[in-house]
Protein backbone atom coordinates (compact mmCIF):
# COMPACT_ATOMS: atom_id res chain seq x y z
CA UNK A 1 0.00 0.00 0.00
CA UNK A 2 2.65 2.25 0.64
CA UNK A 3 4.09 2.24 -2.75
CA UNK A 4 1.07 2.67 -4.03
CA UNK A 5 1.24 6.34 -2.10
CA UNK A 6 4.64 6.73 -3.25
CA UNK A 7 3.63 7.36 -6.61
CA UNK A 8 0.92 10.01 -5.80
CA UNK A 9 3.01 12.60 -7.99
CA UNK A 10 3.13 16.50 -6.49
CA UNK A 11 -0.26 18.17 -7.06
CA UNK A 12 -1.93 15.39 -5.48
CA UNK A 13 -2.34 13.73 -1.93
CA UNK A 14 -2.85 9.69 -1.44
CA UNK A 15 -6.38 9.26 -0.84
CA UNK A 16 -7.05 6.50 2.12
CA UNK A 17 -10.82 6.77 1.61
CA UNK A 18 -10.55 5.67 -1.36
CA UNK A 19 -8.42 2.82 -1.33
CA UNK A 20 -5.02 4.69 -1.91
CA UNK A 21 -6.37 6.35 -4.87
CA UNK A 22 -4.23 9.86 -5.98
CA UNK A 23 -6.35 12.41 -5.47
CA UNK A 24 -6.13 16.25 -6.69
CA UNK A 25 -5.66 18.52 -4.11
CA UNK A 26 -8.85 20.44 -2.87
CA UNK A 27 -9.36 23.92 -3.47
CA UNK A 28 -6.68 26.42 -1.80
CA UNK A 29 -4.10 23.61 -0.60
CA UNK A 30 -1.38 22.09 -2.12
CA UNK A 31 1.47 19.68 -2.34
CA UNK A 32 4.95 20.05 -3.10
CA UNK A 33 5.96 16.72 -3.02
CA UNK A 34 5.05 13.40 -4.15
CA UNK A 35 3.66 10.54 -1.65
CA UNK A 36 1.84 12.75 0.64
CA UNK A 37 -1.26 11.66 2.58
CA UNK A 38 -2.56 15.48 3.10
CA UNK A 39 -2.39 18.41 1.17
CA UNK A 40 -1.22 21.70 2.93
CA UNK A 41 -3.23 24.85 3.17
CA UNK A 42 -2.82 27.85 0.71
CA UNK A 43 -1.58 31.04 2.70
CA UNK A 44 -4.40 33.52 2.12
CA UNK A 45 -2.27 36.91 1.73
CA UNK A 46 -4.71 39.65 2.85
CA UNK A 47 -4.96 42.32 5.34
CA UNK A 48 -1.37 44.04 5.29
CA UNK A 49 -0.04 41.32 2.79
CA UNK A 50 -0.60 41.30 -1.24
CA UNK A 51 -0.48 38.39 -3.49
CA UNK A 52 3.11 37.93 -5.13
CA UNK A 53 2.94 34.66 -6.11
CA UNK A 54 -0.74 32.75 -6.30
CA UNK A 55 -0.80 29.17 -4.75
CA UNK A 56 -0.52 26.14 -7.11
CA UNK A 57 -1.32 22.67 -6.65
CA UNK A 58 1.88 22.40 -5.98
CA UNK A 59 3.51 25.32 -4.29
CA UNK A 60 2.30 27.52 -1.57
CA UNK A 61 1.58 31.22 -2.49
CA UNK A 62 4.06 34.06 -1.41
CA UNK A 63 3.14 37.47 -0.24
CA UNK A 64 4.63 41.06 -0.16
CA UNK A 65 3.49 43.74 1.77
CA UNK A 66 1.04 46.00 1.08
CA UNK A 67 2.42 50.10 1.00
CA UNK A 68 3.56 52.03 4.11
CA UNK A 69 4.75 48.37 5.22
CA UNK A 70 7.89 46.31 5.40
CA UNK A 71 8.25 42.46 5.10
CA UNK A 72 10.01 40.72 8.08
CA UNK A 73 11.97 37.39 7.09
CA UNK A 74 12.94 36.59 4.24
CA UNK A 75 9.75 34.52 3.71
CA UNK A 76 7.77 37.67 4.82
CA UNK A 77 6.28 35.90 7.39
CA UNK A 78 5.02 39.45 9.26
CA UNK A 79 4.24 43.11 7.77
CA UNK A 80 5.63 45.87 10.12
CA UNK A 81 4.54 49.20 9.75
CA UNK A 82 7.28 51.55 8.13
CA UNK A 83 7.66 54.71 10.17
CA UNK A 84 9.55 58.42 9.10
CA UNK A 85 13.57 58.91 8.85
CA UNK A 86 13.87 59.79 12.15
CA UNK A 87 11.05 57.77 14.03
CA UNK A 88 11.36 53.98 15.32
CA UNK A 89 8.24 51.43 15.61
CA UNK A 90 7.50 50.93 19.09
CA UNK A 91 4.74 49.10 20.78
CA UNK A 92 2.61 52.72 20.77
CA UNK A 93 3.68 53.08 16.88
CA UNK A 94 6.01 55.27 15.71
CA UNK A 95 7.94 57.37 17.57
CA UNK A 96 10.30 60.20 17.53
CA UNK A 97 14.55 59.34 18.25
CA UNK A 98 15.02 60.25 21.73
CA UNK A 99 18.12 63.26 21.29
CA UNK A 100 21.41 61.50 20.61
CA UNK A 101 20.22 58.70 18.55
CA UNK A 102 19.23 58.99 14.95
CA UNK A 103 17.44 56.58 12.25
CA UNK A 104 18.06 57.43 8.50
CA UNK A 105 15.69 54.19 6.72
CA UNK A 106 11.89 53.26 7.31
CA UNK A 107 12.52 50.66 9.50
CA UNK A 108 14.82 49.78 11.91
CA UNK A 109 15.21 51.35 16.18
CA UNK A 110 16.95 54.65 16.71
CA UNK A 111 20.63 54.49 16.99
CA UNK A 112 22.90 56.86 19.27
CA UNK A 113 24.85 59.15 16.86
CA UNK A 114 28.62 58.42 16.79
CA UNK A 115 30.95 59.36 19.76
CA UNK A 116 33.94 60.73 17.33
CA UNK A 117 35.87 61.82 20.71
CA UNK A 118 36.07 58.20 21.37
CA UNK A 119 38.71 57.87 18.02
CA UNK A 120 40.12 61.16 18.92
CA UNK A 121 37.78 63.43 16.04
CA UNK A 122 35.50 66.03 16.95
CA UNK A 123 32.12 66.59 15.49
CA UNK A 124 32.63 68.03 12.19
CA UNK A 125 28.64 68.02 11.27
CA UNK A 126 25.98 67.77 14.15
CA UNK A 127 23.89 64.81 14.30
CA UNK A 128 20.25 64.95 14.10
CA UNK A 129 16.96 62.62 14.16
CA UNK A 130 17.81 60.86 10.91
CA UNK A 131 21.49 61.89 10.24
CA UNK A 132 24.03 60.65 12.22
CA UNK A 133 27.45 63.09 13.21
CA UNK A 134 30.14 63.31 10.87
CA UNK A 135 33.22 63.40 12.07
CA UNK A 136 36.12 65.73 11.78
CA UNK A 137 40.10 65.71 12.52
CA UNK A 138 41.19 65.77 15.91
CA UNK A 139 41.41 69.11 17.66
CA UNK A 140 45.09 68.87 17.29
CA UNK A 141 45.23 68.59 14.08
CA UNK A 142 42.95 71.99 13.59
CA UNK A 143 45.75 74.94 12.79
CA UNK A 144 46.13 77.48 15.87
CA UNK A 145 43.10 79.79 16.30
CA UNK A 146 40.43 77.71 14.23
CA UNK A 147 37.61 77.47 15.76
CA UNK A 148 36.39 73.86 17.46
CA UNK A 149 33.27 72.42 16.47
CA UNK A 150 31.06 71.57 18.92
CA UNK A 151 31.60 67.99 20.96
CA UNK A 152 28.94 65.70 20.90
CA UNK A 153 25.72 65.66 23.06
CA UNK A 154 25.86 62.46 25.33
CA UNK A 155 24.63 59.50 23.55
CA UNK A 156 21.25 58.39 25.66
CA UNK A 157 19.37 54.87 25.11
CA UNK A 158 17.38 54.29 21.55
CA UNK A 159 13.68 54.20 22.39
CA UNK A 160 11.83 50.79 23.08
CA UNK A 161 12.53 48.61 19.70
CA UNK A 162 9.76 46.17 19.03
CA UNK A 163 9.98 42.47 19.27
CA UNK B 1 5.08 12.88 6.24
CA UNK B 2 4.20 12.82 9.87
CA UNK B 3 5.37 14.13 13.31
CA UNK B 4 6.63 12.14 16.57
CA UNK B 5 6.39 13.91 19.85
CA UNK B 6 8.74 12.52 22.75
CA UNK B 7 9.68 13.47 26.32
CA UNK B 8 6.75 13.05 27.92
CA UNK B 9 6.94 11.87 31.55
CA UNK B 10 5.20 11.54 35.45
CA UNK B 11 7.11 14.68 37.01
CA UNK B 12 6.84 16.49 40.40
CA UNK B 13 5.07 19.97 41.37
CA UNK B 14 7.71 22.72 40.24
CA UNK B 15 9.85 20.20 38.09
CA UNK B 16 10.91 21.08 34.05
CA UNK B 17 10.61 18.84 31.05
CA UNK B 18 11.27 19.22 27.33
CA UNK B 19 9.47 17.39 25.00
CA UNK B 20 10.43 17.16 21.38
CA UNK B 21 8.44 17.01 18.20
CA UNK B 22 10.59 15.12 15.41
CA UNK B 23 9.43 15.71 11.95
CA UNK B 24 9.72 12.74 9.37
CA UNK B 25 8.62 13.01 5.21
CA UNK B 26 9.89 16.91 5.37
CA UNK B 27 12.25 19.24 6.46
CA UNK B 28 11.78 22.91 7.99
CA UNK B 29 14.20 24.01 4.67
CA UNK B 30 9.88 24.87 3.65
CA UNK B 31 8.48 27.37 5.85
CA UNK B 32 6.00 26.38 8.67
CA UNK B 33 4.77 27.47 11.49
CA UNK B 34 5.47 24.23 13.95
CA UNK B 35 3.09 24.44 17.23
CA UNK B 36 2.26 22.79 20.63
CA UNK B 37 -1.16 22.38 21.75
CA UNK B 38 -2.23 20.35 24.79
CA UNK B 39 -5.23 18.85 26.18
CA UNK B 40 -5.79 17.59 29.58
CA UNK B 41 -7.81 14.40 30.03
CA UNK B 42 -11.15 14.47 29.57
CA UNK B 43 -10.96 18.56 28.55
CA UNK B 44 -10.97 20.91 25.10
CA UNK B 45 -7.80 21.47 22.98
CA UNK B 46 -5.74 24.27 24.15
CA UNK B 47 -2.68 26.27 21.91
CA UNK B 48 0.07 26.32 23.63
CA UNK B 49 3.12 28.46 21.26
CA UNK B 50 3.67 28.36 17.70
CA UNK B 51 7.54 28.79 15.85
CA UNK B 52 7.66 29.88 12.40
CA UNK B 53 10.36 27.72 11.26
CA UNK B 54 11.51 30.41 8.05
CA UNK B 55 14.37 32.82 8.35
CA UNK B 56 12.27 35.15 11.03
CA UNK B 57 12.29 32.41 13.41
CA UNK B 58 9.39 33.92 14.78
CA UNK B 59 7.79 32.26 18.22
CA UNK B 60 3.97 33.17 18.98
CA UNK B 61 2.81 32.63 22.46
CA UNK B 62 -0.83 31.92 24.48
CA UNK B 63 -0.66 34.48 27.16
CA UNK B 64 -1.14 31.97 29.67
CA UNK B 65 1.81 30.69 28.37
CA UNK B 66 4.45 33.13 28.05
CA UNK B 67 7.39 33.27 30.56
CA UNK B 68 6.98 29.20 32.09
CA UNK B 69 7.25 27.51 28.24
CA UNK B 70 9.52 28.09 25.33
CA UNK B 71 9.34 26.58 21.91
CA UNK B 72 12.63 26.42 20.23
CA UNK B 73 13.97 25.26 16.34
CA UNK B 74 16.68 22.66 17.23
CA UNK B 75 17.52 21.21 13.62
CA UNK B 76 15.74 20.96 10.52
CA UNK B 77 13.42 18.51 11.63
CA UNK B 78 13.30 19.08 15.46
CA UNK B 79 11.23 21.43 17.86
CA UNK B 80 10.91 21.54 21.38
CA UNK B 81 9.03 22.50 23.83
CA UNK B 82 10.66 23.56 27.18
CA UNK B 83 8.38 23.79 30.21
CA UNK B 84 9.64 24.98 33.70
CA UNK B 85 7.45 25.15 37.47
CA UNK B 86 4.98 22.38 36.46
CA UNK B 87 2.08 22.31 38.54
CA UNK B 88 -1.11 19.25 38.27
CA UNK B 89 -2.49 21.74 35.92
CA UNK B 90 0.10 20.79 33.34
CA UNK B 91 -0.71 17.22 33.27
CA UNK B 92 -2.22 16.85 29.37
CA UNK B 93 -1.65 14.93 26.47
CA UNK B 94 1.03 17.29 24.70
CA UNK B 95 0.38 17.69 20.36
CA UNK B 96 2.66 18.66 17.51
CA UNK B 97 0.97 20.10 15.25
CA UNK B 98 1.97 21.76 11.86
CA UNK B 99 0.23 24.84 10.11
CA UNK B 100 1.22 26.25 6.41
CA UNK B 101 -1.34 28.66 6.35
CA UNK B 102 -0.19 31.08 8.76
CA UNK B 103 -3.63 31.38 10.45
CA UNK B 104 -3.61 28.32 12.94
CA UNK B 105 -4.69 25.58 11.18
CA UNK B 106 -3.19 22.31 11.46
CA UNK B 107 -3.37 19.73 8.91
CA UNK B 108 -0.80 17.61 10.13
CA UNK B 109 -0.53 16.18 13.90
CA UNK B 110 1.12 14.10 15.82
CA UNK B 111 0.02 11.06 18.41
CA UNK B 112 0.56 13.17 21.62
CA UNK B 113 3.23 12.63 24.63
CA UNK B 114 1.38 12.74 28.07
CA UNK B 115 2.96 14.57 30.99
CA UNK B 116 1.87 14.06 33.85
CA UNK B 117 2.63 16.13 37.42
CA UNK B 118 2.09 14.86 40.45
CA UNK B 119 3.82 14.46 43.95
CA UNK C 1 -7.10 37.66 24.19
CA UNK C 2 -9.44 35.89 21.26
CA UNK C 3 -12.55 33.36 22.88
CA UNK C 4 -14.41 31.19 20.71
CA UNK C 5 -17.62 30.09 22.03
CA UNK C 6 -19.00 26.81 20.52
CA UNK C 7 -22.53 25.45 21.49
CA UNK C 8 -23.82 23.28 21.96
CA UNK C 9 -21.66 21.00 23.61
CA UNK C 10 -23.45 17.94 23.06
CA UNK C 11 -25.59 16.78 20.26
CA UNK C 12 -27.51 13.95 19.47
CA UNK C 13 -28.63 12.57 15.65
CA UNK C 14 -30.11 9.94 13.74
CA UNK C 15 -28.23 7.96 11.11
CA UNK C 16 -29.10 10.14 7.59
CA UNK C 17 -29.88 13.19 9.85
CA UNK C 18 -27.88 16.34 10.34
CA UNK C 19 -26.40 18.10 12.50
CA UNK C 20 -25.32 21.55 12.53
CA UNK C 21 -22.76 23.31 15.53
CA UNK C 22 -22.08 26.40 16.06
CA UNK C 23 -19.45 28.88 16.78
CA UNK C 24 -18.92 32.75 18.06
CA UNK C 25 -15.56 34.68 18.36
CA UNK C 26 -14.91 37.09 20.21
CA UNK C 27 -13.54 39.49 17.45
CA UNK C 28 -13.45 39.65 13.94
CA UNK C 29 -11.44 36.76 12.73
CA UNK C 30 -12.22 37.17 8.44
CA UNK C 31 -12.39 33.31 7.43
CA UNK C 32 -9.44 32.63 9.68
CA UNK C 33 -11.58 29.51 11.18
CA UNK C 34 -10.75 25.30 10.80
CA UNK C 35 -12.73 22.39 12.24
CA UNK C 36 -11.48 19.86 13.66
CA UNK C 37 -12.96 16.27 14.52
CA UNK C 38 -11.17 14.03 17.35
CA UNK C 39 -11.85 10.90 18.21
CA UNK C 40 -10.95 9.25 21.31
CA UNK C 41 -6.95 8.37 21.95
CA UNK C 42 -6.43 10.00 18.38
CA UNK C 43 -5.13 13.35 17.58
CA UNK C 44 -7.90 16.11 15.97
CA UNK C 45 -7.89 15.54 12.53
CA UNK C 46 -8.52 18.68 9.97
CA UNK C 47 -11.94 19.18 8.28
CA UNK C 48 -12.75 22.91 7.37
CA UNK C 49 -10.17 25.79 6.80
CA UNK C 50 -10.70 28.99 5.86
CA UNK C 51 -14.29 28.51 7.61
CA UNK C 52 -15.67 26.60 4.30
CA UNK C 53 -13.19 24.74 2.07
CA UNK C 54 -13.07 21.40 2.51
CA UNK C 55 -9.60 19.53 3.69
CA UNK C 56 -7.96 17.00 1.49
CA UNK C 57 -9.70 13.24 2.21
CA UNK C 58 -12.53 14.66 4.06
CA UNK C 59 -16.10 13.26 2.89
CA UNK C 60 -18.16 16.09 1.08
CA UNK C 61 -21.04 15.54 3.68
CA UNK C 62 -19.23 18.24 5.70
CA UNK C 63 -19.45 21.89 5.32
CA UNK C 64 -18.29 24.89 6.79
CA UNK C 65 -20.05 28.28 6.37
CA UNK C 66 -19.83 31.77 8.02
CA UNK C 67 -17.11 34.92 8.15
CA UNK C 68 -16.63 37.81 10.57
CA UNK C 69 -17.65 36.32 14.18
CA UNK C 70 -20.21 33.46 13.35
CA UNK C 71 -19.85 30.24 12.20
CA UNK C 72 -21.25 26.90 11.38
CA UNK C 73 -20.25 23.19 10.87
CA UNK C 74 -23.00 21.18 8.88
CA UNK C 75 -22.89 17.30 8.68
CA UNK C 76 -25.22 16.20 6.58
CA UNK C 77 -26.03 12.49 6.38
CA UNK C 78 -24.64 11.53 9.58
CA UNK C 79 -22.91 8.48 9.60
CA UNK C 80 -22.04 6.41 12.43
CA UNK C 81 -18.33 7.08 11.91
CA UNK C 82 -19.26 11.01 12.71
CA UNK C 83 -19.67 10.19 16.63
CA UNK C 84 -16.49 12.51 17.66
CA UNK C 85 -15.71 15.88 19.41
CA UNK C 86 -15.87 18.75 17.16
CA UNK C 87 -13.61 21.80 17.81
CA UNK C 88 -13.62 25.50 15.93
CA UNK C 89 -10.31 26.90 15.69
CA UNK C 90 -9.63 30.55 15.48
CA UNK C 91 -6.78 33.15 15.07
CA UNK C 92 -3.82 34.71 12.98
CA UNK C 93 -0.45 35.86 13.72
CA UNK C 94 0.00 39.22 14.44
CA UNK C 95 3.01 39.94 16.42
CA UNK C 96 4.68 37.80 19.19
CA UNK C 97 3.35 40.22 21.98
CA UNK C 98 -0.22 40.13 20.64
CA UNK C 99 -0.84 36.76 19.44
CA UNK C 100 -4.75 35.58 18.74
CA UNK C 101 -5.49 31.88 18.79
CA UNK C 102 -8.12 29.78 20.06
CA UNK C 103 -9.82 26.28 20.21
CA UNK C 104 -13.66 26.60 20.80
CA UNK C 105 -15.04 24.00 23.99
CA UNK C 106 -16.07 21.31 21.61
CA UNK C 107 -19.20 19.72 20.59
CA UNK C 108 -19.43 15.96 21.00
CA UNK C 109 -21.60 14.63 18.40
CA UNK C 110 -23.75 10.97 19.73
CA UNK C 111 -25.08 8.85 16.57
CA UNK C 112 -28.07 7.20 17.61
Known amino acids: LQDLCSNCPAGTFCDNNRSQICSPCPPNSFSSAGGQRTCDICRQCKGVFKTRKECSSTSNAECDCISGYHCLGAECSMCEQDCKQGQELTKKGCKDCCFGTFNDQKRGICRPWTNCSLDGKSVLVNGTKERDVVCGPSPADLSPGASSATPPAPAREPGHSPQ | QSLEEAGGDLVKPGASLTLTCTAS?????????MCWVRQAPGKGLEWIAC????????TYYANWAKGRFTISKTSSTTVTLQMTSLTAADTATYFC????????????WGQGTLVTVSS | ALVMTQTPASVSAAVGGTVTINCQAS??????LAWYQQKPGQPPKLLIF???DLASGVPSRFSGSGSGTQFTLTISGVQCDDAATYYC??????????????FGGGTEVVVK
Open chain 2, 97 to 108: ARDSSSYYMFNL
Open chain 2, 25 to 33: GFSFTSSYY
Open chain 2, 51 to 58: IYTGSSGS
Open chain 3, 27 to 32: EDIDNY
Open chain 3, 50 to 52: YAS
Open chain 3, 89 to 102: QGGYYTSSTDTRGA
